[in-house]
């Protein structure tokens, strides 16, 4: 047969679906690899073919579309499972072809088991909401296309294993879940179970979102350097170890890049001849404020080292800060060398 443009295994799309639930999976070719959509391809005489490789097998085989109750079917560029089974796990390939053209891509599909409290190996999307903000809404994700707009499904929301009924600041409103003045105690996994009828059968869709309450934009500040500060003097004798922590607080800012660095006499540590070690540690508060500590250490400090200018710098999207450490030689009355 003619050569086929093979996009390989698209591991960017690690699709996970729950066992015994409907799943609709769009062929990734039209979403990520080709410039035209399925309708255009279809009207040009191209055919979409599906096949799969079972888990732990090498053999590609066609998908059986003649199962009882049409358990697996294809509709346009969508592969349907009504419902999935555990052994549907494998790599699925969709191929678009005619006599002169061929393009295909494979993607992994994992069918995941869950327990009665919705615990599973499924990776959940994370929704960050600002603490004390007025109202935050989350919407039951990835349920579009499963039922027509004429069908009104029933939706039940859970926090962890508990149905959300009479939660003081969390209100289920159909597909939406509203949080009023959220607090850190609202952190957790929120699950919507959507139940809809189709051809005399009831299907369930289970979707979980992890809610993380984070610091509010109104509290966002430039970095605050706790250490070094003007109150602490690092007084050392030559030959001793000099250890200076640069401890910086960063309030949570969505998508902010927080940086901490040292300069010695205005240069980065890598650009000076001093034998310096820098160790960094990071800790987070309950609202994802960040405290970043960079410890600068010189094992055996020289008199020259004790005359250098050590400055801690910090930066985030709100601004920059810097603070010099007060370093002096023991028994030496001043931090600067005396010039006569």
């Amino acid at each position: 047969s003619e050569r086929c443009d093979d996009w390989g295994l698209d591991t960017m799309r690690q699709i996970q679906v729950f066992e015994d639930e409907p799943a609709r999976i769009k062929c990734p070719l039209f979403e990520h690899f080709l410039k035209y959509n399925y309708s255009t391809a279809h009207s040009s005489g191209l055919t979409l073919i599906w096949y799969w490789t079972r888990q732990d097998r090498d053999l590609e085989e066609p998908i059986n579309f003649r199962l009882p109750e049409n358990r697996i079917s294809k509709e346009k560029d969508v592969l349907w499972f009504r419902p999935t089974l555990l052994n549907d796990t494998g790599n699925y390939t969709c191929m678009l072809r005619n006599t002169t053209y061929c393009s295909k891509v494979a993607f992994p599909l994992e069918v995941v088991q869950k327990d009665s409290c919705f615990n599973s190996a499924m990776r959940f999307p994370v929704h960050k909401m600002y603490i004390e903000h007025g109202i935050h809404k989350i919407t039951c994700p990835n349920v579009d296309g499963y039922f027509p707009s004429s069908v009104k499904p029933s939706v039940t929301w859970y926090k962890g294993c508990t149905e959300i009924v009479d939660f003081h600041n969390v209100l289920p409103e159909g597909m939406n879940l509203s949080f009023f003045i959220p607090l850190v105690s609202n952190n957790g996994n929120y699950t919507c179970v959507v139940t809809y009828p189709e051809n005399g059968r009831l299907f369930h869709l289970t979707r979980t979102v992890t809610v993380k309450v984070v610091g509010s934009p109104k509290d966002a500040l430039p970095p605050q350097i706790y250490s070094p500060n003007d109150r602490v003097v690092y007084e050392k004798e030559p030959g001793e170890e000099l250890v200076i922590p640069c401890k910086v607080y960063f309030s949570f800012i969505m998508d902010s890049h927080n940086e901490v660095w040292w300069t010695i006499d205005g240069k980065k540590p890598d650009d000076v001849t001093v034998d310096i070690t820098i160790n960094e540690s990071v800790s987070y508060s309950s609202t994802e404020d960040e405290t970043r500590t960079q410890i600068l250490s010189i094992k055996k400090v020289t008199p020259e080292d004790l005359r250098r200018n050590y400055v801690c710098h910090a930066r985030n999207t709100k601004g920059e800060a810097e603070q010099a450490a007060k370093v002096k030689q023991k028994g030496n009355g001043c931090t600067e060398p005396m010039t006569l």
Partner: antibody, heavy 118, light 107 residues
Framework: EVQLLESGGGLVQPGGSLRLSCAAS????????MSWVRQAPGKGLEWVSA????????LYADSVKGRFTISRDNSKNTLYLQMNSLRAEDTAVYYC???????????WGQGTLVTVSS | EIVMTQSPATLSVSPGERATLSCRAS??????LAWYQQKPGQAPRLLIY???TRATGIPARFSGSGSGTEFTLTISSLQSEDFAVYYC?????????FGQGTKVEIK
């Protein structure tokens, strides 16, 4: 200096209405959630209602839900509590208080007395 | 809602002595607990937040401890101005709830 000053209390008949105000000064009002807390004569403190700093989110104690409405005007640095269908058990000193999740109710007004009696 | 229970209801202490007030939550409130002092005819005043952090201007003789469900307010050496009613309050979950109060009176 942070100051909260309540007004609007008084004597009202059961079933009547009253609107309390709380004028804030000395801080950036629009950055803080605000609450009403009440204290019946000789009793303890009871949280009544809260409003988010942006005014969009509101919460109420079950005892006042559907009867009381909290609101704020950030341009006037003022918090309000509209109280309808008042009952004898609503008789209390009503305090407005500033809140943060990190520090709870860190500043309180001096209170205004609401008496519901026929 | 989370129920806060304070004990004792009344504590009789001599000036200069130590006072220990207890507060128990019906479920964990982490460290999201505050203590307030209220004198007759006055508004409550924040003493402690985060279970153990003193509010601005609060003397060092006031200290808080505990986390989860058990909390303590300690006044190391009672001064005459410390005789008042003390309330604990959780702000972990809405609705924020108060204990019924402990009255500290002169013995």
């Amino acid at each position: 200096e942070v100051q909260l000053l309540e007004s609007g209390g008084g004597l009202v008949q059961p079933g009547g209405s009253l609107r309390l105000s709380c004028a804030a000064s000395g801080f950036t009002f629009s950055h803080y959630g605000m609450s009403w807390v009440r204290q019946a004569p000789g009793k303890g403190l009871e949280w009544v209602s809260a409003i988010s700093y942006d005014g969009e989110g509101t919460l109420y104690a079950d005892s006042v839900k559907g009867r009381f409405t909290i609101s704020r005007d950030n341009s006037k640095n003022t918090l309000y509590l509209q109280m309808n269908s008042l009952r004898a058990e609503d008789t209390a000193v009503y305090y407005c208080a500033r809140f943060r999740y990190y520090t709870a109710f860190d500043y309180w007004g001096q209170g205004t007395l609401v008496t519901v009696s026929s | 809602e989370i129920v806060m229970t304070q004990s004792p209801a009344t504590l009789s202490v001599s000036p200069g002595e130590r006072a220990t007030l207890s507060c128990r939550a019906s479920q964990s409130v982490s460290s999201n607990l505050a203590w307030y002092q209220q004198k007759p005819g006055q508004a409550p005043r924040l003493l402690i937040y985060g279970a153990s952090t003193r509010a601005t201007g609060i003397p060092a003789r006031f200290s808080g401890s505990g986390s989860g469900t058990e909390f303590t307010l300690t006044i190391s050496s009672l001064q005459s101005e410390d005789f008042a009613v003390y309330y604990c309050q959780q702000y972990n979950n809405w609705p924020w709830t108060f204990g019924q109060g402990t009255k500290v009176e002169i013995k």
